[in-house]
Interface confidence: low
Amino acid sequence: KPSNEATGNVSHSGMKKEFLHELKAENIKKFLYNFTRTPHLAGTQNNFELAKQIHDQWKEFGLDLVELSHYDVLLSYPNKTHPNYISIINEDGNEIFKTSLSEQPPPGYENISDVVPPYSAFSPQGTPEGDLVYVNYARTEDFFKLEREMKISCSGKIVIARYGKVFRGNMVKNAQLAGAKGMILYSDPADYFVPAVKSYPDGWNLPGGGVQRGNVLNLNGAGDPLTPGYPANEHAYRHELTNAVGLPSIPVHPIGYDDAQKLLEHMGGPAPPDSSWKGGLKVPYNVGPGFAGNFSTQKVKMHIHSYTKVTRIYNVIGTLKGALEPDRYVILGGHRDAWVFGGIDPQSGAAVVHEIVRSFGTLKKKGRRPRRTILFASWDAEEFGLLGSTEWAEEHSRLLQERGVAYINADSSIEGNYTLRVDCTPLMYSLVYNLTKELQSPDEGFEGKSLYDSWKEKSPSPEFIGMPRISKLGSGNDFEVFFQRLGIASGRARYTKNWKTNKVSSYPLYHSVYETYELVVKFYDPTFKYHLTVAQVRGAMVFELANSIVLPFDCQSYAVALKKYADTIYNISMKHPQEMKAYMISFDSLFSAVNNFTDVASKFNQRLQELDKSNPILLRIMNDQLMYLERAFIDPLGLPGRPFYRHIIYAPSSHNKYAGESFPGIYDALFDISSKVNASKAWNEVKRQISIATFTVQAAAETLREVA
């Protein structure tokens, strides 16, 4: 096809300006309003209706093809006729305190009937009764402190932990491993209440009755618990529930800090080990087990009646066909399902995606197609374990691994209004730096300055002077399957808070009923200028990835990152110098492979400068080398015990799904190695993991060599 079909004779930069200029804050605001009128819990009629609406609107916006893609996956709901709660019972078995069954609805939402009460999705049913143990954030190190230093056993106890620091599924896993028979999760004011800010509806803080919903799975990338590795379609073989992946084995329930106060105020046992175990409630934060003094005969009882159910979910998939390279896919995806109204999570992201689709559609209607195909996705059931995106990627994995250029994630656009936050593959570092230099900063005091300028000042890189921070990809969002399983270059961007002055874990109203449209309009982004900036960043990333003649990937940034990660893991290992020597552990091979990668990447970039871009075959060859570089870090065997985490350079931390870990195979082999019973076996596994990492880096380097 003639190249003018791709651009309508408008230059790349002119077309990009037109695309960015078409993005309007007022539209994003309007879309956010529309998407937050009712709850959109996965598997419910409301969320199906919204899928149909988005489907119809994307067609109107001008996409070539829009389809609903459905799967039947395992979801979890509270029992309407048998509510979940926690009680304190006296020695006669009488309930003397019960936690709230629901949150008070926010003003204006009193008559909305389908607000799901707070619950921990996928908790099993059960009514455990016993003594309480306070376990801080329920991190690995918190249980080490309890069990190893304080000699307190959680076996047969109900543990209570404060949300924050790590993914709640990891908290539950740790509690199970410690032998707990039930777990209570609560939001402590120290983590979800910023001093001097009012509670909702008068401010953006969490009120005492507010509760964070969320799933407590440990899927490790499996997707639907009943169909790991394969799409949950009508042909799927489904495991029995007893063999489902990642389900917790103990009842779990979340509460707010008003209810937590009642459970914690009479705790007995030793005082908290240090100030890092003390929250913001007026309670002693004694560890337990059990209550003190006159209250020692009282017990805590959980009443959990939630159920799991195979339920139909719906993704919306929109296609804008590429004019010149229709077999190369750039994907922009974000979820649509919400715990309740989703004012921030996810609809602040979905509204931005909607406006990006509208802008691309406007260009297409003028005859200006992208060079490559763009796929837009509205994912379902993200909140239940990234299910919609994972099932779709499982169904289309063969196409994606052959044709997937990049995946840009688009969940919540804001978690604050201070500065930009970006997590991405090193391949995208220079892309992000370059495009933020071309965008206006929305921040006060940076009028007339670029987004790059405000970002680097407010969030400087810890390694590279004069550059902004870009973080590693972890998980907990829909890029997981694309990056960690399939090895498709991925990135995400949103506006965030000032982490130096604002110590709260997430934004305080995260996953509560108070996460409303009004929260955003009144307190976070009244003019929607931050939403617009995020739309410009996400949109420009997609635009460049879909339209640049040479893919905007920088393999030399990967080389720099690999060197840093190799240094880091070597330093961790060197905390055990005697064992390193005794078991002959050497990182020389890994450093050699990294040096080789650096050399090959440099030569590749040199050839790229000299490339005759008018030769479509040579151009495609080098673009394919760039596209497939991320794929080269995938090990088909996966990481130990985590077959769907296959990226050797990055994986979600085994201790916190949200965080990214570099050289995760080596890191996990080294973790807590000094307490392993069989030291020889443990250090042998370190050696094996070093060899896997070495091979992988070396093999990836080979893909960048001249093809013949």
Epitope: T38, G43, T44, Q45, N46, F48, E49, K52, Q53, Y77, K80, T81, H82, S113, D114, R312
Partner: antibody, heavy 123, light 108 residues
Framework: QVQLQESGPGLVKPSETLSLTCTVS??????????WGWIRQTPGRGLEWIGT???????YYNPSLKSRLTLYMDTSKQEFSLRLTSVTAADTAVYYC???????????????WGQGTLVTVSS | DVVMTQSPATLSLSPGERATLSCRAS??????LAWYQQKPGQAPRLLIY???TRATGIPARFSGSGSGTEFTLTISSLQSEDFAVYYC??????????FGGGTKLEIK
Amino acid sequence: QVQLQESGPGLVKPSETLSLTCTVSGASFSSSGYYWGWIRQTPGRGLEWIGTMFYSGATYYNPSLKSRLTLYMDTSKQEFSLRLTSVTAADTAVYYCARHRGPDSGLDAFDLWGQGTLVTVSS
Amino acid sequence: DVVMTQSPATLSLSPGERATLSCRASQSVSSYLAWYQQKPGQAPRLLIYGASTRATGIPARFSGSGSGTEFTLTISSLQSEDFAVYYCQQYNNWPPLTFGGGTKLEIK
């Protein structure tokens, strides 16, 4: 405002198939979020729920009628319909169509009804 | 199936009196219960849902109470237009949705 109107033959012969249609005006199937049901009333058995469907195609049938019953919908015409096969005199009743909120709601009562149509099964 | 039993089958009262109608479920239906009014030649009309919440446009003299298996519809001061047949219906456990046999409220 939203209105429901049943239509179909008033007389059906035994062993034949009873077909009724309910036309919805004033609301869209695909945006309202309601479920659409059929209920019948006989002097002997009182009110009896027949079945319900959602515009996604999800159907819920009374187990006592399931083997003979089909519900289907034409969203373009804003109609939903009932087919009951192998009818007998016991199927003589006033048939109502009605809307309700569906199984994931705590408000699942029939808040709007058609005026009803009498169907007699007789040779 | 959940069987709904209404009592009495017929209730004879005068205008201005208080009417109390009962509905019993064969097993707990929580508060997922509705009440309907039906006049001759008309379709049923929703009065109460959720055991105690009045539907739109229903006068305050109608009230519902109860949960679990025992429910009551009360009409505080009967008006002439209130004489009709009243049905209860459960929607806790379905399919099937089930109705009571009805209580006929007639003028004494």
